[in-house]
């Protein structure tokens, strides 16, 4: 099964959980937990590249990220197939490949990805802002169509020759950034623990400060390390989590595909992983929006009152002490 790896955004532990576990809980376990790589659900990707050697030659690559078997792939340009798009190629895993000008070479790259090279000469040649679409008929997921065009920064004169597409390449910077923050947090945590170990035990003497002061001092390192590791939401490579589709709709295509079987098998629909996300019926727009993104499998933009750097119920002043502001 091909899935898109995603690195969930860092988030603070839920207040309820933290309350239940006490204030000693360090953020590190939570951070490590959120860094577990999760598997994605069906998704279609489209990559469009202009050849550096031939300015009017395009390479289109499409892939299906899912567990189903591909029964048909249709590549079109000028928009989706049902909306004014013109079919360039139809690829069937058993019946072969059919292509139309200006398609030069259509081929299967893997069981779930294809590539198409377009000839660029004459009236039928594609232009830089042409939209290319790929429709995957997959069993049992159903029919999935996605489109792509040349990215805004595509300057064929400057671009390197096409290389195999690393799907997560553009997100490496974000991943490295988060790794850096994590590394720094771990080092800082170790430093604090070491300092805490080597510190001489305080002598017991009557204190004129409030009875809460020693506790505030004692837990300051924990609080500080928590604050240090509370990173704002960082959507590294978000993926919605659409549930699987019920029916397959193979593309009608040219007459010689007419005899293709239509799969109408129904996949048992278990409760979706995100179906139980409670969305407030009324309330702040922020909470509604967060609920929606949770429902869509996206990390919500954290703009609401949920993020607190001071999980201690006593508020910011609990940070006072060796590391706090006096």
């Amino acid at each position: 099964m091909r899935t898109e790896a995603q690195v969930p955004a860092l988030q603070p532990p839920e207040p309820g959980l933290e309350g239940a576990m006490g204030h000693r809980t360090l953020v590190l376990p939570w951070v490590l937990l959120t860094l577990c790589v999760t598997a994605g659900t069906p998704e279609v990707w489209v990559q469009v590249r202009m050849e550096a050697t031939e300015l009017s030659s395009f390479t289109i690559r499409c892939g299906f990220l899912g567990s189903g078997s591909i029964s048909l792939v249709t590549v079109s340009w000028g928009g989706p197939n049902g909306a004014g798009g013109t079919t360039l190629a139809v690829l069937h895993p058993e019946r072969g490949i059919r292509q139309w000008a200006p398609a030069r070479q259509a081929r299967w790259e893997t069981q779930s990805s294809i590539s198409l090279i377009l000839e660029g000469s004459g009236a039928s040649s594609p232009c830089a802002n042409t939209t290319f679409c790929c429709k995957f008929a997959s069993f049992p997921e159903g029919s999935w169509e996605a489109c792509g065009s040349l990215p805004p920064s595509s300057d064929p004169g400057l671009s390197a020759p096409p290389t195999p597409a690393p799907i997560l390449r553009a997100d490496l910077a974000g991943i490295l950034g988060v790794s850096g923050v994590l590394l720094f947090g771990c080092v800082y945590l170790l430093h604090l623990l070491r300092r805490h170990k080597h510190r001489p035990a305080p002598r017991l003497q009557p204190s004129r400060t409030s009875p809460q002061a020693p506790r505030a001092r004692a837990w300051a390192p924990s609080q500080a390390s928590q604050a240090a590791l509370h990173v704002p939401y960082a959507t590294i490579n978000t993926s919605c989590r659409p549930a699987t589709l019920d029916t397959a709709h193979p593309h009608g295509g040219p007459s010689w595909w007419a005899s293709l079987p239509t799969h109408a098998a129904h996949r048992p629909q278990g409760p979706a992983a995100w179906a139980s996300t409670p969305i407030p019926a009324r309330g702040s727009f922020v909470s509604v929006e967060n609920g929606l993104y949770a429902q869509a499998g996206e990390r919500p933009p954290h703009t609401g009152p949920g993020l607190t750097l001071f999980p201690d119920p006593r508020g910011p002043r609990a940070m006072e002490g060796p590391l706090g502001v006096r």
Epitope: A146, R169, G174, T238
Partner: nanobody, 120 residues
Framework: EVQVVESGGGLVQSGGSLRLSCAAS????????MGWFRQAPGKEREFVGR??????????SYADFVKGRFTLYGNQARNTVYLQMNSLKPEDTAVYYC???????????WGTGTLVTVAS
């Protein structure tokens, strides 16, 4: 400031087609994800589909009710996304909202919505 504007909504017969457009303007250079949500009368807003750009690759995902009827496509250079809706059903009647987000959610802009009514 980023503005997101939807258009293309209207009244359509059951089984008909409609194409919604969403254009983001302003500081949109780093727009990373653009998607559609919808809210039917008396219901919660729900996810329809989203398009995500990463270098020269575009990723697209849909909600389960789409079942191959809708196609989401767009042009990152123009910060525009389209939702092509075919085989529309009365239950698709809703206000359709577009959402545009940049990487790390620095920008997170919502449109005011466009009404789609499917008559039976």
């Amino acid at each position: 400031e980023v503005q997101v504007v939807e258009s293309g909504g209207g009244l359509v017969q059951s089984g008909g087609s409609l194409r919604l457009s969403c254009a983001a303007s302003g500081r949109t250079r780093s727009m990373y994800v653009m998607g559609w949500f919808r809210q039917a009368p008396g219901k919660e807003r729900e996810f329809v589909g989203r398009i995500k750009w990463s270098g020269d690759t575009t990723y697209t995902s849909y909600a389960d009710f789409v079942k191959g009827r809708f196609t989401l496509y767009g042009n990152q250079a123009r910060n525009t996304v389209y939702l092509q809706m075919n085989s529309l059903k009365p239950e698709d009647t809703a206000v359709y909202y577009c959402n545009g987000r940049s990487r790390f959610n620095v920008i997170n802009a919502w449109g005011t919505g466009t009404l789609v009514t499917v008559a039976s």
